[in-house]
Interface confidence: low
């Protein structure tokens, strides 16, 4: 079935590469384990940024190396990627899937456009 | 190397019960984004889901057969059971357990199957 | 319970024939279909997932397309180990199932 998934349109990364945005999934029954996926899409490309399972109540697991962190409250998940640079801007896509209990409910949002600008290096001091 | 191997089949009684395994390597029952479905397959018929159990122990059963079926695992043997009650004839199958990935729930590890005969 | 529909039931085929089955489901599935070879005392063997994706280490004359209700598994060229039964099965809502199976055998 399909679910509702909101994302805002467009985020500016920090100087740090840091972006964060909110994904938020109408929720049409009571999930108890939740699976939340980013993809990039640039160039009608699609790839896969990070993924994570999690009960309701509990804190987003992503794997140790991946440039994804995230908490959860109600039904809104709380998206910080890291280590972004200029050549990352893209569409950034939230992708919820509720696992558990069936039925199980799938929803794609239509995308965060998350510009990253690499700041300016620092002139050399005399 | 993924591997399933389940055992415990053979020829039980009308009204009985039985208790297959299932027993995993190569990967662990709990890891998240992975669940282990329980199918069977009565001789010379199609495949039928029996239920499945998620990586975070919560499970899943047919509501046809959900008062006489109990899939648990046990993390510490990296095992997974069903048990299955008040058997009748139509219960003779051979038993398969498979693995799939939450990414996309293709079943993409299975065991060899147990064959159970139901049967006075 | 969503409902799967294989056609046909069986087919007689010969070697470097191309194979057409399909799968219709009773409701819209997305694309959360895969399809399953099994031949005779062995269990299944997973083909296509995501109704289109080819699993590794299978041969690419094994393809999948469809969304939705219609589904496709294609054998471009039919080889001598591919004459087994097929299943194809949803996994968009449990309980998850199964087609009846498409049996392809020897002309």
């Known amino acids: 079935k399909a679910m509702h998934v909101a994302q805002p349109a467009v985020v500016l990364a920090s100087s740090r590469g840091i972006a964060s945005f909110v994904c938020e999934y109408a929720s049409p029954g009571k999930a108890t384990e939740v699976r939340v996926t980013v993809l990039r899409q640039a160039d009608s490309q699609v790839t896969e940024v990070c993924a994570a399972t999690y009960m309701m109540g509990n804190e987003l697991t992503f794997l140790d190396d991946s440039i994804c962190t995230g908490t959860s409250s109600g039904n809104q998940v709380n998206l910080t990627i890291q280590g972004l640079r200029a050549m990352d801007t893209g569409l950034y896509i939230c992708k919820v899937e509720l696992m558990y209990p069936p039925p199980y409910y799938l929803g794609i949002g239509n995308g965060t456009q998350i510009y990253v600008i690499d700041p300016e290096p620092c002139p050399d001091s005399d | 190397e993924v591997q399933l191997v389940e055992s415990g089949g053979g020829l039980v009684q009308p009204g009985g019960s039985l208790r297959l395994s299932c027993a995993a390597s190569?990967?662990?029952?709990?890891?998240?984004?992975?669940?282990v479905g329980w199918i069977r397959q009565a001789p010379g018929k199609g495949l039928e889901w029996i239920g499945e159990?998620?990586?975070?122990?919560?499970?899943y059963y047919p509501p046809s057969l959900k008062s006489r079926v109990t899939i648990s695992r046990d993390n510490s043997k990296n095992t997974l059971y069903l048990q299955l009650n008040s058997l009748r004839a139509e219960d003779t199958a051979v038993y398969y357990c498979?693995?799939?990935?939450?990414?996309?729930?293709?079943?993409?590890?299975w065991g060899q199957g147990t064959l159970v005969t139901v049967s006075s | 319970d969503i409902q799967l529909t294989q056609s046909p039931s069986s087919l007689s085929a010969s070697v470097g024939d191309r194979v057409t089955i399909t799968c219709r489901a009773s409701?819209?599935?997305?694309?959360?279909l895969a399809w399953y070879q099994q031949k005779p005392g062995k269990a299944p063997k997973l083909l296509i997932y995501?109704?289109?994706s080819l699993e590794s280490g299978v041969p690419s004359r094994f393809s999948g397309s469809g969304s939705g209700t219609d589904f496709t598994l294609t054998i471009s060229s039919l080889q001598p180990e591919d004459f087994a039964t097929y299943y194809c099965?949803?996994?968009?809502?449990?309980?998850?199932?199964f087609g009846q199976g498409t049996k392809v055998e020897i002309k």
């Open positions: 498979a693995r799939y990935e939450y990414s996309s729930y293709g079943l993409d590890y």
């Open positions: 190569g990967f662990s029952l709990s890891t998240g984004g992975v669940g």
């Open positions: 159990i998620y990586h975070s122990g919560s499970t």
């Open positions: 409701q819209d599935i997305r694309k959360f």
């Open positions: 995501d109704a289109s």
């Open positions: 099965q949803q996994s968009y809502r449990s309980p998850r199932t």
